[in-house]
């Protein structure tokens, strides 16, 4: 079986998937569902997963949810908010994904893959 995916490859694959679901997309992602905004700092991957996992019935982000789980060291389930330190603002999934995508590109360019 293939060995573990290098962190740089995993991050780039996550970036590519976020690009896939946002490119030239004008229809509201996940029917305009709202999710908790997160701080794009330490624990970001778990926080992002905890936020997005509460969106159900949206096939467009299912692969993203699976990929994020590979970056988060603990199991995440709906309604769990241990990494979401600040829950005061809700934004549309599309904006959440766009913000996350920009931050991940920044991390990639800076060589911060973990």
């Amino acid at each position: 079986s293939p060995g573990p995916v290098p962190p740089s490859t995993a991050l780039r694959e996550l970036i590519e998937e976020l690009v896939n679901i946002t490119q030239n997309q004008k229809a509201p992602l996940c029917n305009g569902s709202m999710v908790w905004s997160i701080n794009l700092t330490a624990g970001m991957y778990c926080a992002a997963l905890e936020s997005l996992i509460n969106v159900s019935g949206c096939s467009a982000i299912e692969k993203t949810q699976r990929m994020l789980s590979g970056f988060c060291p603990h199991k995440v389930s709906a309604g769990q908010f241990s990494s979401l330190h600040v829950r005061d603002t809700k934004i549309e999934v599309a904006q959440f994904v766009k913000d996350l995508l920009l931050h991940l590109k920044k991390l990639f360019r800076e060589g911060r893959f973990n």
Partner: antibody, heavy 126, light 109 residues
């Protein structure tokens, strides 16, 4: 000033090969998605294919009529886009344009193909 | 394969409003882009993301979209607006680009 300059066009026999180049300047080429578009004499614009920036996966997509015959590549160190055309047919005769596609992609914006070169002419004839 | 459909030609008198339509099944979820091409020149982007106008494009150019139809409107068309206009979008996957067949705008001088 943002600029794209195509080169490499010419006359080639059916079944032959040709490589087009597109030299970019005035913007961060490595951030840009790049496209090739062609226009046969007296006809409309036809999308040929596109290559994403490396950070966005470097994915390449092709239009059905050229898939398997044409190859798009890029050299970010040379700020250059390429179109390798093999097994050329008479219907590939056209002006070939390169265009930026999402110069603002890094910032999360989509502008469409907002900068175009002046084109290079490819004639496939026996 | 995915297609975008445009009328082959539209004619207006100077000062009149010209409307060019583009229809495609994926347009409810994918943006439309409009290009102007004058004879012997490279295309120029005049509208992006359905309604947005790049800097340098005159205000008389506007875009709209409803359902499977995108529309380019030129309010108070001028003789210099005479050109071929192409709509562009992507298929539902977003991975493959497609142009409409083009519309020749004639401004009867």
């Amino acid at each position: 000033e943002v600029q794209l300059v195509e080169s490499g066009g010419g006359l080639v026999k059916p079944g032959g090969s040709l490589r087009l180049s597109c030299a970019a300047s005035g913007f961060t080429f490595s951030n840009a998605w790049m496209s090739w578009v062609r226009q046969a004499p007296g006809k409309g614009l036809e999308w040929v294919g596109r290559i994403r920036s490396k950070i966005d996966g470097g994915t390449i997509n092709y239009a059905a009529p050229v898939k398997g015959r044409f190859t798009i590549s890029r050299d970010d160190s040379k700020n250059t886009l390429y179109l390798q055309m093999n097994s050329l047919k008479t219907e590939d005769t056209a002006v070939y344009y390169c265009a930026t596609d999402q110069v603002g992609a890094y910032y999360g914006d989509y502008y469409g193909m907002d900068v175009w070169g002046q084109g290079t002419t490819v004639t496939v004839s026996s | 394969s995915y297609e975008l459909t445009q009328p082959p030609s539209v004619s207006v008198s100077p000062g009149q409003t010209a409307r060019i339509t583009c229809s495609g099944d994926a347009l409810p979820e994918k943006y439309a882009y409009w290009y102007q091409q004058k004879s012997g020149q490279a295309p120029v982007l005049v509208i992006y993301e359905d309604t947005k106008r790049p800097s340098g494009i005159p205000e008389r150019f506007s875009g709209s979209s409803s359902g499977t139809m995108a529309t380019l409107t030129i309010s108070g068309a001028q003789v210099e607006d005479e050109a071929d206009y192409y709509c562009y979008s992507t298929d539902s996957s977003g991975n493959h680009g497609v142009f409409g067949g083009g519309t020749k705008l004639t401004v009867l001088g």
